[in-house]
């Protein structure tokens, strides 16, 4: 159904007489003032910018010659100023003006809240020509009005490069309350007060608010929107909503859950990603956060060894990412690992413990009693050593790495040799005569290469010298190796 919201203006009499005062309005007809009781002084608005007042000393003549009898005022006729209707109804309103036929190219545009309504709007302009003037009726219709159609509508017409503006038609679409602010889900500390806010608007106003907790009304008397509910504290989870009431009916907000913060659940699925001799990379799946964000986590490490004192190493780390590299571990050792995380309320229980092992490490000591001497042929250097006393954690010895550096007249050349674990001697070919050979030996396990022994130097003379004395590493505690020639 179309709501015809049109109030026809009465016929315009010939100039009705002067208005008191010296101001008039440019879009109130000076030729007649229908729908007003008595003549009131008004503001005269500028021709080009409605709403901008200017003063003018204008007196309107009571009687004019026959020539002006047919001339209508250059103003839109008064129409209904305010239309109230319910959502989804149809509405039609119009503005009308009579224009002398000399102004034949006039067009009327519709504007809403200061913006021109273009395109897909149902605006129809009808022309009713007469001998002297043409009556123009511009109609605007809206089918199934929505709240967004609320606003101030005006007509504009351009004549002689000036804009003539109609009085506004206010469209007020009424419906059920519309929430502009609904309560939000919250996580709160047990027995601590908090606030919930609910705001709804019409039209029609006023809008009254009732609060509902777990399906029961909280307030006996409604509160005018907006409403703030102060809850003194909860001991268990609750669901809150608000009801907004106006003359058109009731709208219920979404129900929001208010959770009580608690300590987190323990992490789960602690996994080993990578093990080395001295570190283990772990990850875990966080448990439920207890409605409070995780702050940090603690990785707890126990050595699984009947001989260890059972002490626990604790490594603190950030809650994210859910991964940590445990360092400073013993090689070839077994560990039990657990993870616990905390939020603002406290620490979770520890996750289920998992077993992890480090791999074997490299030797921690160098071979002992390294001796070096030139054999009789003077083509080879003999090297001898003693097997180092390696710890179990270093793993099984797989061999040795020999480094020999040859230095002569500013030239230096390093060579590496690998020998098996059963050897405790080796022979290397002389690379350069009249040069110094520096030898170092390291033990090798599957865990890697251990430290090199202190260097032992031997001088390789030119051909013709006779000297077979060995060089050796010093006894432990001596500062420098001794070169014996």
């Amino acid at each position: 159904a179309i709501t015809e919201a049109r109030e026809e203006a009465k016929p315009y009499p010939l100039f009705p007489g002067p208005l008191p005062g010296s101001l008039q309005t440019d879009h109130t007809s000076l030729l007649s003032l229908p729908h007003t009781s008595g003549y009131q002084p008004a503001l005269m608005f500028s021709p080009t910018q409605p709403g901008r007042p200017y003063t003018g000393n204008v007196a309107i003549p009571r009687v004019t010659s026959a020539g002006s009898k047919l001339l209508p005022p250059l103003a839109f006729k008064h129409t209904v100023g305010h239309i109230i209707l319910s959502e989804h109804k149809d509405v039609k309103f119009n503005c009308s003006i009579s224009v002398p036929n000399i102004y034949q190219d006039t067009t009327i545009s519709w504007w809403k809240d200061g913006k021109e309504l273009l395109g897909a709007h149902h605006a129809i302009t009808q022309f009713y020509p007469d001998d002297e003037v043409t009556a123009i009726i511009a109609s605007f219709s809206i089918t199934s009005v929505q709240r967004s159609d609320n606003g101030s509508y005006i007509c504009k017409m351009k004549i002689n490069n000036e804009e003539i503006v109609s009085d506004p038609i206010y469209i007020e679409v009424q419906g059920l309350p519309h929430f502009t602010k609904q309560p939000e889900s919250m996580n709160v500390t047990r027995n601590t007060a908090f606030n919930l806010t609910c705001q709804a608007v019409g039209p029609p106003e006023p809008v009254n608010i009732f609060w509902v907790q777990n399906s029961s009304r909280v307030n006996e008397q409604p509160e005018k929107s907006p409403s703030v509910l102060t809850v003194p504290g909860l001991t268990e989870m609750a669901v809150f909503s608000c009801e907004a009431h106006n003359d058109k009916g009731l709208t219920v907000s979404k129900g929001v859950q208010i959770n009580i913060k608690a300590i987190p659940s323990p992490p789960t699925e602690v996994s080993i990603h990578n093990s080395t001799a001295h570190s283990i990379l772990i990850s875990w799946v966080p448990g439920f956060d207890g409605y409070s964000p995780f702050r940090n986590c603690s990785v707890q490490v126990k050595e699984v060894d009947p001989l260890s004192n059972g002490s626990v190493m604790i490594f603190n780390t950030s809650a994210s990412p859910h991964m940590y590299q445990i360092k400073q571990l013993q090689a070839l050792a077994n560990y039990s690992i657990g993870v616990s995380c905390m939020n603002e309320i406290g620490w979770s229980a520890v996750s289920p413990w998992i077993l992890a092992s480090t791999t074997e490490g490299a030797p921690s000591v160098a071979p002992l009693n390294v001796t070096v001497f030139l054999n009789e042929s003077r083509d080879n250097v003999d090297i001898r050593w003693m097997k180092p006393l390696t710890k179990r954690q270093a793993g099984e010895l797989v061999g040795y790495r020999i480094s020999h550096v040859w230095q002569s007249a500013g030239i230096s050349k390093e060579l590496l040799e690998e020998v098996g674990q059963n050897n405790s001697r080796a022979q290397i070919s002389v690379q350069v005569h009249n040069a110094t050979c520096t030898v170092r030996i390291a033990a090798v396990t599957k865990g890697g290469v251990g430290p090199f022994s202190d260097p032992v130097k031997i001088f390789i003379p030119a051909h013709g010298w006779v000297d077979h004395a060995p060089s050796s590493t010093p006894a432990p505690g001596n500062a420098d190796p001794v070169l014996i020639i």
């Epitope: 000076l30 021709p47 080009t48 200017y54 250059l74 000399i102 002689n160």
Partner: antibody
Framework: EVQLQQSGPELVKPGASVKIFCKAS????????MDWVKQSHGKSLEWIGD????????IYNQKFKGKATLTVDKSSSTAYMELRSLTSEDTAVYYC????????????????WGTGTTVTVSS | DIQMTQSPASLSVSVGETVTITCRAS??????LAWYQQKQGKSPQLLVY???NLADGVPSRFSGSGSGTQFYLKINGLQSEDFGSYYC?????????FGGGTKLEIK
């Protein structure tokens, strides 16, 4: 006091262009249209056109289309008129005038006139 | 375009006399007419608007009348400052034309 102050006299060569101005004071510039009028020596007045300072919309007398271009600068409350392809026929005094409307009628009038700018076209 | 015919083109009168200047429109312009006075070397000044309304500050010896196609400007008891040129102008439609002017001289 409402005033329309126009630019000084111009001596221009045939075929050239000239841009003259009209600076408004004492009122809200955007509230009224500004019209321009030509008066050749010893002759009557001719309406050139008008401009709406609010939106820059213009209406020209058919005779002056292509000859005159009207513009405004709202920030300085100044109206401009550019005349191009000048000939001796364009030698005249040019006035700006504030246009006003009588209430809600179709009766306009020029209530304030500028001081006038003399444009002389001569080689 | 609407033509405005003003008469007489010139008039020689004495101080104290009454004069009437006529302006005729080529078609009905209702009351959309203004009268201006211009003195030598000066800008025009508004005398009458909407055919019959006296502008601010204009002496009451001036009066405008008429509507449709025939309009009159009457000056009762001419003063020396009234000498100069007088123009009518219509504002009907979208192009406004002036009359040819009437030059008022002292006899």
């Amino acid at each position: 006091e409402v005033q329309l102050q126009q630019s000084g006299p111009e001596l221009v060569k045939p075929g050239a262009s000239v841009k003259i101005f009209c600076k408004a004071s004492g009122y809200t510039f955007t509230a009224y249209n500004m019209d321009w009028v030509k008066q050749s020596h010893g002759k009557s007045l001719e309406w050139i056109g008008d401009i709406n300072p609010n939106n820059g919309g213009t209406i020209y007398n058919q005779k002056f289309k292509g000859k005159a271009t009207l513009t405004v600068d709202k920030s300085s409350s100044t109206a401009y008129m550019e005349l191009r392809s000048l000939t001796s026929e364009d030698t005249a005094v040019y006035y700006c005038a504030r246009r006003r409307r009588y209430g809600n009628t179709y009766y306009w009038y020029f209530d304030v006139w500028g001081t006038g700018t003399t444009v002389t076209v001569s080689s | 375009d609407i033509q405005m015919t003003q008469s007489p083109a010139s008039l020689s009168v004495s101080v104290g006399e009454t004069v009437t200047i006529t302006c005729r429109a080529s078609e009905n312009i209702y009351s959309s007419l203004a009268w201006y006075q211009q003195k030598q070397g000066k800008s025009p000044q508004l005398l009458v608007y909407a055919a019959t309304n006296l502008a601010d500050g204009v002496p009451s010896r001036f009066s405008g009348s008429g509507s449709g196609t025939q309009f009159y400007l009457k000056i009762n008891g001419l003063q020396s400052e009234d000498f100069g040129s007088y123009y009518c102008q219509h504002f009907w439609g979208t192009s406004y034309t002036f009359g040819g002017g009437t030059k008022l001289e002292i006899k």
